[in-house]
């Protein structure tokens, strides 16, 4: 199986230099001083979020670091390389024919990326074909300044898209979460992600997933029957990474989808989600943009109750309190609501079965000129045991044919002050949103309202 030599930290090979790898050779993208770096690891995880403009929270509400700030900081940190996987790029207002001051943060990010290239820092981008941003010029602008860009033809390879959203910086730092490389993700869409600093073990593991995209981005690429050993992961749900994050004992691993892009040792994204749900004993709180126990992008749709069944089983079989917060905006498919009502109908407090579903409506306000925005785009789940931060919406395609990643983190609530674990921080963010006035019960979301904020 012929693949191009993958990038080392300082250099991404140009598209037209195909090389072959020996099975079992050491991963070419790991820097020679990897071991030395790993000994210096002092992992730190920071939750990051975007709150759409004009969406005030109650005073004193918990919050995470603003995503735009975190991204700019990550780029300031970069010394050698930035590898970005993103469904699409649209960092400027003119890309979508919009003149709005809220695009400035995205435009600043694009500038920062260009400056990065000017400082001889390598930028490699894996993006999707098909894409949502067919008129965007961002990647042409960056490529003209030396960025290496590959379109991964997921439509042809798996009948899906590359839906992942993550960065690996210098083989040490990571961003992953719900936000695409889109100015709206910074100011007009509600997003949730995580930044992990100084954690080369995890960064180089996620880099292996980037590499699966990178090698599939060459002309006429085909999916390998078996991925070469270089792509294998040592961290998974059976054998997670163990480390101290700010002194807190932590286990973590990355999952991936679809199965065809899971080399040996990589936990499948769906399996990771189900494992986190299955281990919950007290609560499962999930915030997702879309929830469909069906396929989404095939005609006619097929029924696919895997996640739905898991939530029902947890609530009914183990008395786990289930809360599902679903995005609701002008571009939400209304055929989702019967499925949400069906799930909610299982709730029976008298029998200790607690299932609650709400939709989160971001008021459009005076931002109606900005298409495909003003929505809760998050994809995370939290239980008393673990935090799951993902890039996938909850329907079959995202696990069977679409490329995505998930991060599962568990921290021990031991020596550190209460409330400091990642799962506790994430629970607080969920509860802030759940109890906000923008979270509307299904009874309050009458059909035909089209997710328009009623105030």
């Amino acid at each position: 199986w012929q693949v191009p030599r993958p990038p080392t930290w300082g250099q991404v090979q140009p598209k037209d230099v195909p090389r072959s790898w020996e099975h079992g050779s050491s991963p070419a993208w790991e820097p020679l001083e990897a071991e030395a770096r790993q000994q210096r690891d002092s992992c730190q995880l920071v939750l990051v979020e975007s709150i759409p403009q004009d969406l005030p929270s109650a005073a004193g509400s918990p919050s995470a670091q603003p995503l735009g700030q975190a991204w700019l900081q990550l780029l300031d940190t970069a010394q050698e390389s930035v590898h970005v996987a993103s469904y699409y790029w649209s960092l400027t207002g003119p890309d979508i024919g919009v003149n709005d001051s809220s695009s400035q943060l995205g435009e600043a990010l694009l500038q920062k990326l260009q400056q990065l290239l000017g400082r001889n820092i390598s930028l490699a981008v894996a993006t999707s074909s098909p894409t949502l941003a067919r008129t965007s010029t961002d990647l042409q602008v960056l490529a003209a300044r030396g960025a290496h860009v590959r379109q991964v033809p997921m439509g042809r390879l798996t009948r899906g898209v590359l839906h992942s959203k993550f960065w690996v910086v210098d083989g040490r730092h990571i961003y992953m979460g719900s936000a695409n490389m889109d100015w709206r993700s910074l100011t007009q869409v509600k997003e949730l992600g995580a930044v992990i600093y100084n954690c080369s073990h995890l960064a180089q593991d996620l880099e292996k997933t980037f590499q699966t995209y990178w090698v599939l981005g060459v002309p006429k690429a085909v999916l390998p029957k078996t991925w070469p050993q270089n792509f294998s992961s040592h961290f998974n749900r059976f054998q997670p990474f163990h480390g101290l994050f700010d002194g807190v004992p932590t286990t973590a691993y990355f999952s991936a989808s679809p199965p065809a892009l899971c080399p040996q040792g990589r936990t499948r994204d769906l399996e990771a989600l189900l494992a986190v749900m299955g281990s919950a004993q007290e609560f499962i709180y999930a915030s997702v943009m879309e929830y469909f126990p069906t396929t989404r992008f095939s005609h006619p749709p097929r029924y696919w109750p895997v996640l739905d069944n898991a939530l029902r089983a947890a609530a009914f079989g183990k008395g786990v309190r289930v809360r599902l917060l679903v995005g609701c905006g002008l571009n939400t498919d209304p055929t989702m609501f019967p499925y949400l009502r069906s799930l909610q109908a299982l709730s029976n407090p008298a029998a200790n079965v607690s299932v609650d579903v709400k939709v989160f409506i971001v008021p459009v306000g005076n931002h109606s000129n900005i298409p495909f925005s003003r929505v809760n785009h998050s994809k995370f789940m939290v239980t008393e045991k673990a935090a799951y931060i993902g890039t996938s919406n909850w329907s079959e395609d995202y696990f069977s044919s679409t490329a995505g990643v998930g991060l599962v983190v568990t921290q021990s609530p031991g020596a550190q002050p209460a409330g400091a674990t990642v799962q506790e921080q994430l629970r607080q963010l969920f509860e802030r949103d759940w109890s906000s006035r923008y979270a509307v019960g299904l009874d309050g979301q009458a059909p035909g309202q089209d997710c328009v904020w009623q105030g």
Partner: antibody, heavy 124, light 107 residues
Framework: DVQLQESGPGLVKPSQSLSLTCSVT???????YYWTWIRQFPGNKLEWM?????????NYNPSLKNRISITRDTSKNQFFLKLNSVTTEDTATYNC?????????????????WGAGTTVTVSS | DIQMTQTTSSLSASLGDRVTISCRAS??????LNWYQQKPDGTVKLLIY???RLHSGVPSRFSGSGSGTDYSLTISNLEQEDVATYFC?????????FGGGTKLEIK
């Protein structure tokens, strides 16, 4: 079932304006699609003329930009085509159609419902 | 604008035949291509979207393929009801553009 039906005069004089209505049943024109006009000239050539989006914004074919206007009446669930300064070259069958679906994250767009079309002849 | 060309304006085939209709774009449209069927009464129906995906209710004898600038629609087992004109359409950029159509008749 979603249905689109075009209506309007079958004959228009040169230099006048052509005005057509598309009546939509079974789906709200304020939801999830671009509501489009497409015309078919004698000899079969199809031309995309433009759309009015679910949110009321417009996009027009540059070849028609100075002459075309697409508007809507949400209370009647109708959208309209107005083409000014017509010539005999505008003789065609005019179809309305919807393009989408414009759901978050969906990259696959197509014209999935078409009207039957209405023939307009431009002649003095 | 992207020009879409269907070089064969009409073709004739026998019932049961395998028929292929081709479409060429003036530039790479990255698989953003749809196919439509227009019956003799003028009714237009979506057949295939994004090069190869069958729309709901379309018989499986229809299939699509292609990449870059060259695309094709195949009918594997021609039936009488397939008599129609077939159009390709790109949705890579605005303005949307259509091929000139290929009229399919039965011998």
């Amino acid at each position: 079932d979603v249905q689109l039906q075009e209506s309007g005069p079958g004959l228009v004089k040169p230099s006048q304006s052509l005005s057509l209505t598309c009546s939509v049943t079974g789906y709200s024109i304020t939801s999830h699609y671009y509501w489009t006009w497409i015309r078919q000239f004698p000899g079969n050539k199809l031309e995309w003329m433009g759309y009015i989006s679910y949110d009321g914004s417009n996009n027009y074919n540059p070849s028609l930009k100075n002459r075309i206007s697409i508007t809507r009446d949400t209370s009647k669930n109708q959208f309209f085509l107005k083409l000014n300064s017509v010539t005999t070259e505008d003789t065609a069958t005019y179809n309305c159609a919807r393009e989408g679906p414009l759901y978050y994250g969906n990259p696959y767009w197509y014209f999935d419902v078409w009207g039957a079309g209405t023939t307009v002849t431009v002649s003095s | 604008d992207i020009q879409m060309t269907q070089t064969t304006s009409s073709l004739s085939a026998s019932l049961g035949d395998r028929v292929t209709i081709s479409c060429r774009a003036s530039q790479d449209i990255d698989n953003y291509l749809n196919w439509y069927q227009q019956k003799p009464d003028g009714t237009v129906k979506l057949l295939i979207y994004y090069t190869s995906r069958l729309h709901s209710g379309v018989p499986s004898r229809f299939s699509g393929s292609g990449s870059g600038t060259d695309y094709s629609l195949t009918i594997s087992n021609l039936e009488q009801e397939d008599v129609a004109t077939y159009f390709c359409q790109q949705f890579n950029t605005l303005p949307r553009t259509f091929g000139g159509g290929t009229k399919l008749e039965i011998k």
